[in-house]
Amino acid sequence: MMTGTIETTGNISAEKGGSIILQCHLSSTTAQVTQVNWEQQDQLLAICNADLGWHISPSFKDRVAPGPGLGLTLQSLTVNDTGEYFCIYHTYPDGTYTGRIFLEVLESSVAEHGARFQIP
């Protein structure tokens, strides 16, 4: 029986050209985490395997950094990075847990404009 839950950073936003940390945390289970996959919609970004450690997809090696912890750091963000990200925890004996994060990458001017004209 799967008793665990995944907590994520939820919906987040960041500025174009900046960086962001994607974080998930598996709790309420004693299952052993054997691997975590980080995926963006239909693309595999990286894995952290209990035996082998981190492996970043070669397609993202220049913009993705492992950690902190089991999280993932995305760098040099572009508007095309906007979308859903998934942390997929492979565990034993529970099976697979999946968390979802939505990232919105904003043009710098848009982010500044929004901050400057916020309604109290």
Partner: nanobody, 116 residues
């Protein structure tokens, strides 16, 4: 589940070449990271090279310029072209793959022996 079958190992003289193949079958949809690791007698398994569906690749420093990893996406097969082989390249070479949403899967290994 994903199954991996390696082939192409064997005995080769120093300076020679071999081409390893790793064919994936089963649950092979979506993006992937496929790669090669090796384990020499009495040593730990070490990373050699990886490739993604997008075509990017990474290598351990000791094989850069001598080994080339490639893939045929239509066949879900990865290749490792090994040139200018050295005695220290002698090892069991293992294919490994992760497909979208899936766990890491290992092949059974293929022995490469570099000796005169």
């Amino acid at each position: 589940e994903v199954q991996l079958v390696e082939s192409g190992g064997g005995l080769v003289q120093p300076g020679g070449s071999l081409r390893l193949s790793c064919a994936a079958s089963g649950r092979t949809f979506g993006d992937y990271i496929m790669g090669w690791f090796r384990q020499a007698p009495g040593k730990e398994r070490e990373f050699v090279a990886t490739i993604s569906r997008g075509g990017g690749s990474t290598y351990v420093d000791s094989v850069k310029g001598r080994f080339t990893i490639s893939a045929d996406n239509s066949k879900n097969t990865a290749y490792l072209q090994m040139n200018s082989l050295k005695p220290e390249d002698t090892a069991v070479y293992y294919c490994a793959a992760v497909f979208s949403r899936g766990p890491l899967t290992w092949g059974q290994g293929t022995l490469v022996t570099v000796s005169s």
